[in-house]
Interface confidence: low
């Protein structure tokens, strides 16, 4: 969630002024950034404490700026270092003199682990010494006076981990500050590898993007955004929503970008050299300059954005004909969210060409932790996340952003939660007065601890030894009569409060107890099977009380009707429910229960359901227009068992007519299988859209149907359907 | 009464075949998987295959796998394990089972019919 | 494949002792556990189902008890007709597995 930029301008130190800027760009720490000097990289550099100011250019951003006259004391490796949820993220750097007598190809080099790798230095001062090449300061090699070559190179075979580190050059009779660095970073990975056991293939990070072996996602170079890198930002901007921008005359000239490894540092898109202040070649791209432009069709290649593709082609040659994409927008977000502590399920909603997938967004938390959708669905036109957090505090409250990450681009859009502290009554209620079958309650419902303002109060009431769930009144005043009571049963009673919003219900309060007077005892009966969630059905049933003594429970038996699955349980003869869980999605149960003692009970008749579905519904099917009038026609259909369809939606509107002059017709009631319009106009050609909705949200049509209504003196007609793609 | 009952056991040489017969009585044999479960002498139990004669839906260990085959004959409310490439360590009794409704519990089992693989 | 380990794999008892075997299975299985009681040269019986269930016809001093790997069956009041050799089966996953058997033997 932390996207750190270090800007090191400039890497090679003359006698100009240069800095180090560390950003932390649309990520707000709790613990401030950090630059200071790399000493695990050379331990034997300047010790001087580096005079770190605010960039008032930035809200985020530390800089530390050395002026000519300090030339001598810059030499050397530098860090800058963010930290959220305890975990640094640590921005490596170096800096060097111009008159150092080798310079390296490059300020970093990433390499994957297994590589053959080549460090090279280039020689620019010509003495009669020998070379010397350390690594994290340490002797590493030699090469005698009289065969230095131009190109003084360290061979590495099939890189490992241990290999990376600040490689140095320099004579003999040099020291750090005639010393080159360049450092080495070797992904703990083979090439296109990640995870712990690398055996997770890599997204192809395009533009030289760099995969990270601990994520697999894309370290995206300065210029470039999305999950693989491949769109390019608007002119001058750089981070991870390229929502930075280079304020120099030329851009982002004499800027080295470094970012977290395994990425290192490079130029900016559009710049090459080691002080990156050389523009690409015409033909190159990118950072560093080092893609070349492949145009189809003679596109122009930009140095900054490379191909520059006409309408209705993509990709990085222009190879691909296809819609053109479409940085994500966060869509539907207020700024400020009031939330109840307990369970949260904020949303996400995001347009986008391609639409962002579930993957594709996340929320980050005020501490840094990245949460993923629990539930995710779309429509035409936008992508909606909703995220679950079992239990939101106080604490939570804050900044959250929620982020999306697509091919087309990133947006992050931050907005502030403010938790709030459900209430709770601090008093028990008092009981007034009691009969066989009622009870008069004072719910005493002020004092009440937490906050306000309460919506509406909840009187809870329950036997003491059914263990059957509470049930409940909602009550306005503070007196409130109870009515049908069991007779001779002892109750509890406690008071909810409800503030605004939802999950407003606040703890109940401290619990009374009471007793009716007695009365004789109705018999039980009632089991009904109900779907609670995709992984859940609720199996009820009325008290039991059996006409003896002896000891009894209920057993269930459940069983799935497509899979080969059969559970037993066992449930308390005082239960009066059964949560069956650990389900599947979309599947079909049959369950039965009887009442055991020392000899089995006889087995109830079946009952069946299905647990909510985890997709979205089929089209329905066998869609039929017939019966057509002058002014009215019939339209039926079937649709599948299965899908926890809800209701059916008729969408109709005369051919032609704008989108939104359609007509939707609601049939919430699921099992109706035909529907007949009416009020239509004569010699009408109508566009008939029919489409299904369950708790995941709606199907969608491939057809429309086309309904053409009669002259006002012709028969009725029948339609078999005629299709008109869309 | 639900009844197992295994036929066709005896003794073969090893690389030899067998065919093992379990006729069923007393239940919807459709409505039933079936399994072979054997035991070798002085051993526990294993399960060698089960069959869905329903849909002749069929499982195997890993241990027969290529060997055996399962089948079942719904109109003579037969299941079959047809045994090829016998080698010694196949030597059992091999008890006919039935998983009643789903393939869970053995809730009825044959008396069990003696496989001998020897030279 | 999931292991079932049961123990002991062979105990002494006397009439009316109160007998406990436990079984282990390498991964959760939920309640998905059996329990069978078997006499030489016959076929297995079945006892307990779903860890828990007591199979019709067998003797209430039959019970089972556990979830995700750690399985009991116990034995109240060991009665004569109760010396045999005992298996735990699990059906969570195919193959179903069993355990290696504990022999109940007389004192």
């Known amino acids: 969630a932390m996207d750190l930029i270090l800007i090191n301008s400039l890497p090679l130190v003359s006698d100009a002024e240069t800095s180090l800027t560390c950003i932390a760009s649309g990520w707000r720490p709790h613990e401030p950034i950090t630059i200071g000097r790399d000493f695990e990289a050379l331990m034997n550099q300047h010790q001087d404490p580096l005079e770190v100011t605010q960039d008032v250019t930035r809200e985020w951003a530390k800089k530390v700026v050395w002026k000519r006259e300090k030339a001598s004391k810059i030499n050397g490796a530098y860090f800058c270092e963010g930290r959220v949820r305890g975990e640094a993220i640590r921005i490596r750097t170096m800096k060097m003199r111009q008159q150092a007598s080798f310079l390296p190809a490059t300020l970093t080099m990433t390499v994957d682990k297994g590589d053959n790798v080549n460090i090279s230095f280039k020689k620019v001062l010509i003495k009669e010494e020998d070379a010397v090449i350390y690594k994290n300061g340490s002797f590493i090699h030699s090469v005698p006076r009289h065969e230095v070559p131009d190109i003084l190179e360290v061979h590495l075979p099939h890189a490992q981990p241990q290999d990376a580190g600040v490689y140095s050059a320099r004579y003999i009779g040099g020291n750090l500050f005639t010393s080159a660095f360049t450092r080495l970073i070797v992904r703990r990975c083979e090439a296109q590898k990640w995870g712990p056991e690398c055996n997770h293939l890599c997204t192809a990070c395009m533009n030289n993007g760099v995969c990270h072996e601990d994520t697999g996602e894309c370290i995206c170079p300065p210029g470039f955004m999305g999950r693989t890198c491949e769109k390019a930002c608007e002119l001058h901007t750089f981070g991870r929503t390229c929502k930075e921008r280079c304020s120099g005359q030329e851009g982002c000239k004499s800027y080295v970008f470094c970012l977290p490894d395994p990425y290192g540092c490079s130029c900016a898109t559009g710049w090459k050299g080691l002080q990156c202040n050389e523009a690409c070649h015409p033909g190159f791209y990118g950072p560093d300059c080092k893609l070349r432009c492949s145009c189809n069709n003679g596109e122009m290649c930009d140095r900054f954005q490379g191909c520059l593709c006409s309408p209705g082609w993509q990709g990085l040659q222009c190879e691909r004909e296809g819609i053109q994409r479409m940085t994500p927008k966060i869509v539907d977000l207020p700024d400020h969210i009031e939330v109840n502590s307990g369970k949260f399920n904020p949303i996400c909603k995001a347009s986008g060409w391609p639409l962002p997938t579930n993957e594709e967004m996340t929320l980050v938390k005020p501490d840094g932790t990245v949460l993923h959708p629990k539930d995710f669905n779309h429509t035409d036109h936008f992508s909606v996340a909703i995220f679950t957090i079992h239990r939101i505090l106080p604490p939570d409250s804050g900044v959250w952003v929620c982020s999306v990450n697509t091919v087309a681009g990133m947006v992050e859009k931050p907005f502030n939660i403010s938790v709030k502290v459900l209430p709770k009554p601090l008093n028990a209620p008092n009981v007034i007065d009691t009969g066989h079958n009622f009870a008069v309650i004072n719910i005493s419902s002020e004092p009440y601890f937490g906050d306000g303002p309460i919506k509406s109060k909840k009187l809870l009431y329950k036997p003491v030894n059914h263990y059957e769930a509470w049930q409940h009144i909602q009550v306005t005043n503070e007196i409130v009569t109870l009515n049908y009571l069991e007779p001779r049963t002892e109750y509890e009673l406690c008071v909810q409060l409800v503030r605004r919003g939802e999950g407003g219900e606040g703890h109940p309060g401290p619990v009374r107890r009471f007793t009716t007077a007695s009365i004789g005892l109705p018999p039980p009966r009632g089991l009904n099977l109900l779907p609670k969630s995709q992984t859940t059905l609720n199996l009820t049933w009325q008290p039991i009380f059996p006409s003896s003594e002896d000891d009894f429970y209920v057993e269930v038996e459940r069983r799935s009707v497509q899979k080969s699955d059969q559970q037993n349980i066992k449930v308390p003869g005082n239960l009066t429910s059964v949560l069956l869980n650990n389900l599947h999605p979309r599947e079909q149960y049959v369950v039965r229960a009887r009442v055991n003692t020392k000899a089995q009970g006889e087995w109830s008749e079946d009952l069946t359901a299905w647990t909510l579905s985890d997709i979205l519904p089929p089209q329905p099917e066998n869609i039929k227009i017939s019966n057509i009038t002058h002014s009215s026609a019939v339209i039926s259909w079937t649709i599948l068992d299965g899908y926890s369809i809800s209701s059916i939606t008729i969408r109709y509107k005369v051919q032609g007519k704008n989108e939104d002059q359609h007509v939707d017709v609601k049939i919430k009631n699921a099992t109706i299988t035909q529907y007949q319009l009416k009020g239509l106009e004569p010699e009408t050609a109508y566009q008939v859209d029919i489409f299904a909705e369950n708790n995941i949200g709606s199907s969608n049509p491939a057809f429309s149907h086309e309904l053409v209504t009669l002259p006002e003196s012709q028969a009725p007609a029948d339609l078999g359907g005629g299709k008109m793609l869309l | 009464e639900v009844q197992l009952v295994e036929s066709g056991g005896g003794l073969v040489q090893p690389g030899g075949s067998l065919r093992l017969s379990c006729a069923a009585s007393g239940f919807t044999f459709s409505g039933s998987w079936i399994s072979w479960v054997r035991q070798a002498p002085g051993k526990g139990l294993e399960w060698v295959a089960r069959?869905?004669?329903?849909?002749?839906?069929?499982y195997y260990a890993d241990s027969v796998k290529g060997r055996f085959t399962i089948s079942a004959d719904t109109s003579k409310n037969t299941a079959y394990l047809q045994m090829n490439s016998l080698r010694a360590e196949d030597t059992a009794v091999y008890y006919c089972?039935?998983?009643?409704?789903?393939?869970?519990?053995?809730?009825?089992w044959g008396q069990g019919t003696l496989v001998t693989v020897s030279s | 494949d999931i292991q079932m380990t049961q123990s002991p794999s062979s105990l002494s008892a006397s009439v009316g002792d109160r007998v406990t075997i436990t079984c282990r299975a390498s991964q959760d299985v939920s309640t998905a556990v059996a329990w069978y009681q078997q006499k030489p040269g016959k076929a297995p019986k079945l006892l307990i189902y779903?860890?828990?269930f007591l199979y019709s016809g067998v003797p209430s001093r039959f019970s089972g008890s556990g979830s995700g790997t750690d399985f009991t069956l116990t034995i109240s009041s060991l009665q004569p007709e109760d010396f045999a050799t005992y298996y735990c089966?699990?059906?969570?996953?195919?193959?179903?597995?069993f355990g290696q058997g504990t022999k109940v033997e007389i004192k």
């Open positions: 779903s860890a828990s």
């Open positions: 089972a039935r998983n009643n409704r789903f393939p869970t519990w053995f809730d009825y």
């Open positions: 069959i869905n004669p329903y849909d002749g839906n069929t």
């Open positions: 089966q699990q059906s969570y996953t195919t193959p179903p597995t």
